[in-house]
Interface confidence: medium
C-alpha cells in the first residue's frame, strides 16, 4: 500500500549531488509540468536499494539529462 | 560528524501520549528530509511519517493517521513525534533518520529505509494495555 500520497512533484528535500554509477540500475527524467514547475532526475538504484532524486543542478544530474536527451532526439 | 539522537520514550497506558524529539546536528537542516520509523520485535522498520524542513511538507502512515503529528523546530534543528492515542501495537523502536532527497512514483512513496543516510540509536516506546 502507498503510505505518503500527494499530487505535486516527485521529488522532496533538494536531492543528492552524486550517485555512485556502479548503483545506478536506471535513470529517469520528469520534465516540467502542470504538477510540477521544475525538472527532476529520479535514480532507481540497483539490489533494491531503492531511489533517489538527484539535485537537477548537479553536474551528474546535467550529464544524464545530456545522456537521456540525446538518445531520444 | 552527522548525529540523530531520539529521546522521549517511555512506557505508558494504552490511550496515553508521548512527545518524541530528534536532535539533529552535523548537517544543514534545511538541506534534508526527517523521517520515523518502527520497529517492532521480530518485524521489519516500517515507516511512520516524516517531514521536509525545507517546505513543511508532512506525511503518515495509515496506521498513525489522526494520532501522531510531525513537526519540525528548524531554529533547533529538531523534529517532533507527538504520539496521541497510543495503542499496544504501537509498542516499538522508534527511530528518527535523515536523506536529502525521498522520490514518489504516480503521487505514491512506499518509505525504504535504504533511502536514509542517516540514522539515531533508536527510543524504546512500550505501551501498555
Known amino acids: 500500500f502507498p503510505m505518503f500520497k500527494r499530487g505535486r512533484c516527485l521529488c522532496i528535500g533538494p536531492g543528492v549531488k552524486a550517485v555512485k554509477v556502479a548503483d545506478i540500475e536506471k535513470a529517469s527524467i520528469m520534465y516540467p509540468s502542470n504538477n510540477c514547475d521544475k525538472i527532476e532526475v529520479i535514480i532507481t538504484l540497483k539490489e533494491n536499494k531503492g531511489q533517489r532524486c538527484l539535485n537537477p543542478k548537479s553536474k551528474q544530474a546535467r550529464l544524464i539529462i545530456k545522456k537521456v536527451e540525446r538518445k531520444n532526439f | 560528524e552527522v548525529q540523530l539522537v531520539e529521546s522521549g520514550g517511555g512506557l505508558v497506558q494504552a490511550g496515553g501520549s508521548l512527545r518524541l524529539p530528534c536532535a539533529a546536528s552535523g548537517f544543514t537542516f534545511d538541506d534534508y528530509v526527517i523521517g520515523w520509523f518502527r520497529q517492532a520485535p521480530g518485524k521489519e522498520r516500517e515507516g511512520v511519517s516524516l517531514?521536509?524542513?525545507?517546505?513543511?511538507?508532512?506525511y503518515y502512515a495509515d496506521s498513525v493517521k489522526g494520532r501522531f503529528t510531525i513537526s519540525s523546530d528548524n531554529a533547533k534543528n529538531t523534529v517532533y513525534l507527538q504520539m496521541n492515542g497510543l495503542k499496544p501495537e504501537d509498542t516499538a523502536v522508534y527511530y528518527c533518520?535523515?536523506?536529502?532527497?525521498?522520490?514518489?512514483?504516480?503521487?505514491?512513496?512506499?518509505?525504504?529505509?535504504?533511502?536514509?543516510?542517516?540514522w539515531g540509536q533508536g527510543t524504546q516506546v512500550t505501551v501498555s494495555s
Open positions: 517531514i521536509s524542513s525545507s517546505d513543511g511538507s508532512t
Open positions: 533518520a535523515a536523506t536529502s532527497s525521498i522520490p514518489y512514483y504516480s503521487g505514491s512513496y512506499y518509505p525504504n529505509p535504504f533511502e536514509y543516510d542517516y
